[in-house]
């Protein structure tokens, strides 16, 4: 029994530095507790962007200072990352763990390349 995780290949962040994507997993078991982690890979460096554990049927709860928010629906998690700048462009990988009940299962997506373009400052206007 394997757990497959799917996520979009590419997402373009909005001009306000917000990027959203769906992380979907094919659960091999009847998990009641799931942990979702977003990892950023850039220049062979890996950093944890955010993580949340949720009970099936309940909302995801990220830490108060997290740059992520999200909602869940069945085996699908809608993730939003805020406050992104051009330097944050990179591959954002969704890691899903079925925490309870045992057995534990691990699933890692192929990653979503998020492109962030800093907005141009508004030119001075005579009007």
């Amino acid at each position: 029994k394997a757990m497959h995780v799917a996520q979009p290949a590419v997402v373009l962040a909005s001009s306000r530095g917000i990027a959203s994507f769906v992380c979907e997993y094919a659960s091999p078991g009847k998990a009641t507790e799931v942990r979702v982690t977003v990892l950023r890979q850039a220049d062979s460096q890996v950093t944890e962007v955010c993580a949340a554990t949720y009970m099936m049927g309940n909302e995801l709860t990220f830490l108060d200072d997290s740059i992520c928010t999200g909602t869940s629906s069945g085996n699908q998690v809608n993730l939003t990352i805020q406050g992104l700048r051009a330097m944050d462009t990179g591959l954002y990988i969704c890691k899903v763990e079925l925490m309870y009940p045992p057995p534990y299962y691990l699933g890692i997506g192929n990653g979503t390349q998020i492109y962030v373009i800093d907005p141009e400052p508004c030119p001075d206007s005579d009007f």
């Epitope: 757990m3 497959h4 990892l39 944890e48 299962y105 691990l106 890692i108």
Partner: antibody
């Protein structure tokens, strides 16, 4: 740098209890799955148990389920393995190991502590 | 439980030779969640490879991993004196996390 130091091993009679400790430094325990792996003398490696992230979820190997209990003290950044009803077949070197970012492979290991169960 | 089988049990080679170690799983190891470790007498194991083919930090490039599904291989391209040790594979896609019985690489 990351360091794991186990303690608490020793000789104990069958049926008795022992508590192992694993002091972690260089990282925060709650960000990782923390595991115990054991190795009987002259034998291979056997995964024993894991305590996950916030400490609420713990998974155990069938061979120790109901006898061993994992816990954690975040203020001391220390992991504990309470071993009850010990048997001769529990004799082994017990290693504390940290799970990796990409899953439960073990990227850092302690030096191990020997537990001998004998009458 | 996923059972891992390693072969050969012992591999007798000379320094400079190529070592090929095999690890076979009783069922498919999802997304190549397989790791390799090296262990020397009296020491803790050391992570070499994770994700079937990714080298851990500080591991020389003479170590390489390959494979997927149920068949995995650890290759040491040119054996150095310090490479003679026991090597274990481990799956981490599902609990219980299991190890193979090990392959001992000794000096011919």
């Amino acid at each position: 740098q990351v360091q794991l130091v186990e303690s608490g091993g020793g000789v104990v009679q069958p049926g008795r209890s022992l508590r192992l400790s694993c002091a972690a430094s260089g990282f925060t325990l709650s960000n990782y799955g923390m595991h115990w792996v054991r190795q009987a003398p002259g034998k291979g490696l056997e995964w024993v148990a894991v305590i996950w992230y916030d400490g609420r979820n713990k998974h155990y190997a069938d061979s120790v389920e109901g006898r061993f209990t994992l816990s954690r003290d975040n203020s001391k950044n220390t992991l504990y393995l309470q071993m009850n009803s010990l048997r001769a077949e529990d004799t082994a070197v017990y290693y504390c190991a940290r799970g990796g970012v990409w899953g439960s492979y073990f990227d850092y290991w302690g030096q191990g502590t020997l537990v001998t169960v004998s009458s | 439980e996923i059972v891992l089988t390693q072969s050969p049990g012992t591999l007798s080679l000379s320094p400079g030779e190529r070592a090929t170690l095999s690890c076979r799983a009783s069922q498919s190891v999802s997304s190549s969640y397989l790791a390799w470790y090296q262990q020397k007498p009296g020491q803790a194991p050391r992570l070499l490879i994770y994700g079937a083919s990714s080298r851990a930090t500080g591991i020389p490039d003479r170590f390489s991993g390959s494979g997927s599904g149920t068949d995995f291989t650890l290759t040491i391209s040119r054996l150095e004196p310090e490479d003679f040790a026991v090597y274990y594979c481990q799956q981490y896609g599902t609990s219980p996390f299991t190890f193979g019985p090990g392959t001992k690489v000794d000096i011919k």
